[in-house]
Interface confidence: medium
């Protein structure tokens, strides 16, 4: 008479997360007397998945009946996989013991694996804005995938990057993983229409990489460029001067005109352009009253972007001169030209 | 023919630690359940637990908390320890093979038993 | 744990006679699964018959099991003068494995 043997055919299940699986287990004999008991591992820790004596298991069914009486069948489903689930499960047959059933007979155990999906790449820039030729990280974040091989891929509008650094966590065995990613792109003025994508390509999405963007709109600041130029007359004692902002973003500005040094008026940017790049332009003009000034006047055209140090630009209007004889004077001295901008 | 041959301290003090080795001549390890057996002066027979050659052990639950029974596969031996030892643990103590496919077994071979007496 | 009272404590025969020895469990055995065995003075117990009646290596055929669920029986048919001892019946049907406390047989 040959003993008990504890059968399991699978040595290793692959199914996908949310799907049922399937642990087979046949015994080779009706005896001992005793239940099968299922188990994730070995050794003390183990976790008890089914008992065919007792207990309550909701997740588990089993494939053939147990209470009939020349059953050899203990296979078993799992539904609901998710990746914690994985691990090695063992058939034991226990035989009859007092106070508790004594472990008899276990199976060389089914590995299982969980392939799960990973989940929707996030990628995050700077916290704060940058200004064009400046080097910026993005970083790009994806978890609860299964198995740990992974492909990640960094494009910014459709071109591949190659400055990136990836991590998948953990390094060991694990039921699920995460990967980590950060990717440094140089930004260009052209930039405010830009894309960075962040792809991530696993066995579970079945050539239909997944993926995440960020726009550079929310990652750059392109600094205005100041011009002040001086219009041909519109009355008698007065000159039309223009303070042209172009090429900036965001459009957060404020412009204030200073008249020899005092503060002549200020205004937001409302009504702009939008260039074809994304960034913006805007005018200002100031009527200056020639009659009421004695000696020459220095205009300044002050303008705070986004929250930046202010940058200005200044155009000297000679009262001596008769107003209808100056024309559009673009080369005007700026005694203030030298634009400030503070990364 | 199989033989057992067991060895081991045969007088103890009260809390001492018994010991005793069972050697398996003249047939196969593996495949057998091997078993301590204990028998008190004038009494019957008490089984006190097995061992597989795989290591897996089951010990009467009314000395678990102070039995370890061991197994050595390349000397074809196994041991028995019972801590915290007593008067009460002064018995004739016998090694045997345990035969059978139930997943429990009757005994078809027996050491020649070593009388282990705990005294003050 | 299943308990094994075996009857009566002490047998009084004579060789020749037949003697029938109780065993009984307080709850249900698989009838494959008692044994019997003898144990003599200063001596191992003996394996006599385990199973379906089967009986051990050199055991003569006088020595024969009978019974089931909570009772047994061993009978030895013709008593000689070497089988009187101490008999034990053993179950191996549930964990812990128990005995009984034995019957002597004696020469009366």
């Known amino acids: 008479e040959e003993e008990l043997q504890v059968i399991q055919p699978d040595k290793s299940v692959l199914v996908a997360a949310g799907e049922t699986a399937t642990l087979r287990c046949t015994a080779t004999s009706l005896i001992p007397v005793g239940p099968i008991q299922w188990f994730r591992g070995a050794g003390p820790g183990r976790e008890l998945i089914y008992n065919q004596k007792e207990g309550h298991f909701p997740r588990v069914t089993t494939v053939s009946d147990l209470t009939k009486r020349n059953n050899m069948d203990f296979s078993i489903r799992i539904g609901n996989i998710t990746p914690a689930d994985a691990g090695t499960y063992y058939c034991v047959k226990f035989r009859k013991g007092s106070p508790d059933d004594v472990e008899f007979k276990s199976g060389a155990g089914t590995e299982l694996s969980v392939r799960a999906k990973p989940s929707a790449p996030v990628v995050s820039g700077p916290a704060a804005r940058a200004t064009p030729q400046h080097t910026v990280s993005f970083t790009c974040e994806s978890h609860g995938f299964s198995p740990r091989d992974i492909t990640l891929k960094w494009f910014k509008n459709g071109n591949e990057l190659s400055d990136f650094q990836t991590n998948v966590d953990p390094v060991g065995e694990s039921v699920s993983y995460s990967i980590h990613s950060t990717a440094k792109v140089v930004l260009t003025r052209e930039d405010v229409h830009s894309q960075v994508i962040c792809e991530v390509a696993h066995v579970t999405l079945q050539g239909d990489p997944l993926r995440g963007t960020a726009n550079l709109s929310e990652t750059i600041r392109v600094p205005p460029t100041l011009e002040v130029t001086q219009q041909p007359v519109r009355a008698e004692n007065q000159v039309n001067v223009t303070c042209q902002v172009r090429k900036f973003y965001p459009q957060r500005l404020q412009l204030t005109w200073l008249e020899n040094g005092n503060v002549s008026r200020t205004e937001t940017a409302s009504t702009v352009t939008e260039n074809k790049d994304g960034t913006y332009n805007w005018m200002s003009w100031l009527l200056v009253n020639v009659s009421a000034h004695r000696d020459d006047v220095k205009l300044t055209c002050q303008v705070e972007h986004d929250g930046q140090p202010a940058v200005s630009k200044s155009h000297d209007l000679k009262v001596s001169a008769h107003p209808k004889e100056q024309g559009s004077n673009t080369a005007a001295e700026n005694t203030g030209s030298n634009e400030r901008n503070i990364y | 023919q199989v033989q057992l041959q067991q060895w081991g301290a045969g007088l103890l003090k009260p809390s001492e630690t018994l010991s005793l080795t069972c050697a398996v001549y003249?047939?196969?390890?593996?495949?057998?359940?091997w078993s301590w057996i204990r028998q008190p002066p004038g009494k019957g027979l008490d089984w006190i637990g097995e061992?597989?050659?795989?290591?897996?052990?089951n010990y009467n639950p009314s000395l678990k908390r102070r039995v370890t029974i061991s197994i050595d596969t390349s000397k074809n031996q196994f041991s028995l320890k019972l801590t915290s030892v007593t008067a009460a643990d002064t018995a004739v103590y016998y090694c045997?093979?345990?035969?059978?496919?139930?997943?429990?077994?009757?005994?078809?071979?027996w050491g020649q038993g070593t009388l282990v007496t705990v005294s003050s | 744990e299943i308990v094994l009272t075996q009857s009566p404590g002490t047998l009084s025969l004579s060789p020749g006679e037949r003697a029938t020895l109780s065993c009984r469990a307080s709850?249900?055995?698989?009838?494959?699964?008692l044994a019997w065995y003898q144990q003599k003075p200063g001596q191992a117990p003996r394996l006599l018959i385990y199973?379906?009646?089967s009986r051990a290596t050199g055991i003569p055929d006088r020595f024969s099991r009978s019974g089931s669920g909570t009772d047994f029986t061993l009978t030895i048919s013709r008593l000689e003068p070497e089988d009187f001892a101490v008999y034990y019946c053993?179950?191996?049907?549930?964990?812990?494995?128990?005995f009984g406390g034995g019957t002597k047989v004696e020469i009366k």
């Open positions: 003249g047939g196969s390890f593996s495949g057998y359940y």
């Open positions: 709850q249900s055995v698989s009838s494959s699964y």
């Open positions: 061992i597989n050659h795989s290591g897996s052990t």
């Open positions: 199973g379906a009646s």
């Open positions: 045997a093979r345990g035969r059978g496919y139930s997943g429990y077994y009757y005994f078809d071979y």
């Open positions: 053993q179950q191996y049907d549930s964990s812990p494995l128990t």
